[in-house]
């Protein structure tokens, strides 16, 4: 006999919630695998600038993305299938996975906060290397793509430690249109914008992490309530 009333509502709520979660995981995994295997984007992600490889942060980033996508799909499937099948075993595994993920998120949050300066330094180094490559090797479309992504995302251009030729190339080719790099001497310094992102805008990442944590707790509660509901309904 299946669950009834409020518990049934929780069952479908958990199903829909985890179906969306599973889909999102699929999208992330798909994009990550595409980035990993597409030649153009592989060059971009594993950008080797001269004899300097991209910082470790970026090298590892793609695998983190693959892992996140796979875990999201697995956990989403457990929650989805466990809810629709009313399986205490699957829901219990789902709950355990959520607890582990919650612990991982807290650990990642602490690690990220502690290492934010190093991460910011890596990002700045990556930008500088990409910019140097885009200027020295004017055929390096991957490097140009990286530089333009930085410029458009952070609404910045260049840094305060530029060579003459880099300044000229930036002004004419790589700065976002309307950027006042020249009239307002490096006011839109990308190094500064990266620092701002990791210090001033850190609260935004914190808010996002809290939202994810709240959703996780909410899902844990729902899965436990449903599990108890299934146990109780099987007694009668």
């Amino acid at each position: 006999m299946g669950v009834e009333g409020c518990t049934k509502c929780i069952k479908y709520l958990l199903f829909v919630f985890n179906f969306v979660f599973w889909l999102a995981g699929g999208v992330i995994l798909g994009v990550a695998l595409w980035l990993r295997h597409d030649p153009q984007t592989t060059n971009l992600l594993y950008l080797e600038l001269g004899d300097k490889p991209a910082p470790n942060t970026f090298y590892v980033g793609i695998y983190i993305l693959i892992a996140v996508g796979a875990v999201m799909m697995f956990v989403g499937f457990l929650g989805c299938y466990g809810a629709i099948q009313e399986s205490q075993c699957l829901l219990g595994t789902f709950f355990t996975c959520l607890v582990i993920l919650f612990a991982c998120e807290v650990a990642a949050g602490i690690w990220g906060f502690v290492n934010k300066d190093q991460i910011a330094k890596d990002v700045k180094q990556f930008y500088d290397q990409a910019l140097q490559q885009a200027v020295v090797d004017d055929d390096a479309n991957n490097a140009k793509a990286v530089v333009k992504t930085f410029h458009e995302t952070l609404d910045c251009c260049g840094s305060s430690t530029l060579t003459a030729i880099t300044t000229s190339v930036l002004k004419n080719n790589l700065c976002p249109s309307g950027s006042n790099i020249i009239s307002n001497l490096f006011k839109e310094d990308c190094h500064q914008k990266i620092d701002d992102l990791f210090s001033g805008k850190l609260y935004l990442i914190g808010i996002a992490a809290i939202v994810v944590a709240v959703i996780m707790i909410f899902e844990m509660i729902l899965s436990m309530v449903l599990c108890c509901g299934i146990r109780n309904s099987s007694v009668y």
Partner: antibody, heavy 119, light 112 residues
Framework: EVQLLESGGGLVQPGGSLRLSCAAS????????MSWVRQAPGKGLEWVSY????????DYADSVKGRFTISRDNSKNTLYLQMNSLRAEDTAVYYC????????????WGQGTLVTVSS | QSVLTQPFSASGTPGQRVTISCTGS?????????THWYQQLPGTAPKLLIY???NRPSGVPDRFSGSKSGTTASLAISGLRSEDEADYYC???????????FGGGTKLTVLG
């Protein structure tokens, strides 16, 4: 040994055109930015234009913008400067120079070719 | 009128030390762009003498040295020799004009 040899200079009437060439040897031409710098008789040096290794990036001094065109042929190790609508003030010795990214300066220069604009 | 200002001429006797200044502004030398120095012997093409404010390319004697402070760069020649008689040009990049700029040049005369 790095060598840059300019040619194509001469006497031309105002409004006329001229094409300068610079033959490069002794280094990997296709990997280097190249530039033109000129020097009016008895005067100082004036940067004219630069071109990146694969011709993607170019820039010009305001005084020649729209009249001069810089180009290169990496298969021939040659740099060019097409000069149109020439004026008396364009009279100068035109030097071809290699731009060093590492040094951020013009590290090697040709011997120059004289362009005289006169009626 | 050049963007970078150099003395029109300088002179010294053999063995002496001579300094040539190059004054710019906050849009070139003062903006952090490197200053380079070129030597032009009579009737020849310019030759890179000092790059990146104070670095000497191989083959340039250590009698030549460069420095930079604020908006002014300097070229010092110690143990002056007769073969040092030439025009000396400083060069930087101007971010307002978006061009490579040169000084007007300094004619160095070795006396006696």
């Amino acid at each position: 040994e790095v060598q840059l040899l300019e040619s194509g200079g001469g006497l031309v009437q105002p409004g006329g055109s001229l094409r300068l060439s610079c033959a490069a040897s002794g280094f990997t031409f296709s990997s280097n930015y190249m530039s033109w710098v000129r020097q009016a008789p008895g005067k100082g040096l004036e940067w004219v234009s630069y071109i990146s290794s694969s011709s993607t990036y170019t820039d010009y001094a305001d005084s020649v913008k729209g009249r001069f065109t810089i180009s290169r042929d990496n298969s021939k190790n040659t740099l060019y400067l097409q000069m149109n609508s020439l004026r008396a003030e364009d009279t100068a010795v035109y030097y071809c120079a290699r731009y060093s990214y590492g040094r951020d300066s013009f590290d090697y220069w040709g011997q120059g070719t004289l362009v005289t604009v006169s009626s | 009128q050049s963007v970078l200002t150099q003395p029109f001429s300088a002179s010294g006797t053999p063995g002496q030390r001579v300094t040539i200044s190059c004054t710019g502004s906050t849009s070139n030398i003062g903006a952090g762009f490197d200053t380079h120095w070129y030597q032009q012997l009579p009737g020849t093409a310019p030759k890179l003498l000092i790059y990146g404010n104070s670095n000497r390319p191989s083959g340039v004697p250590d009698r030549f040295s460069g420095s930079k402070s604020g908006t002014t760069a300097s070229l010092a020649i110690s143990g002056l020799r007769s073969e040092d008689e030439a025009d000396y040009y400083c060069q930087s990049y101007d971010t307002n004009l978006s061009v490579w700029v040169f000084g007007g040049g300094t004619k160095l005369t070795v006396l006696g």
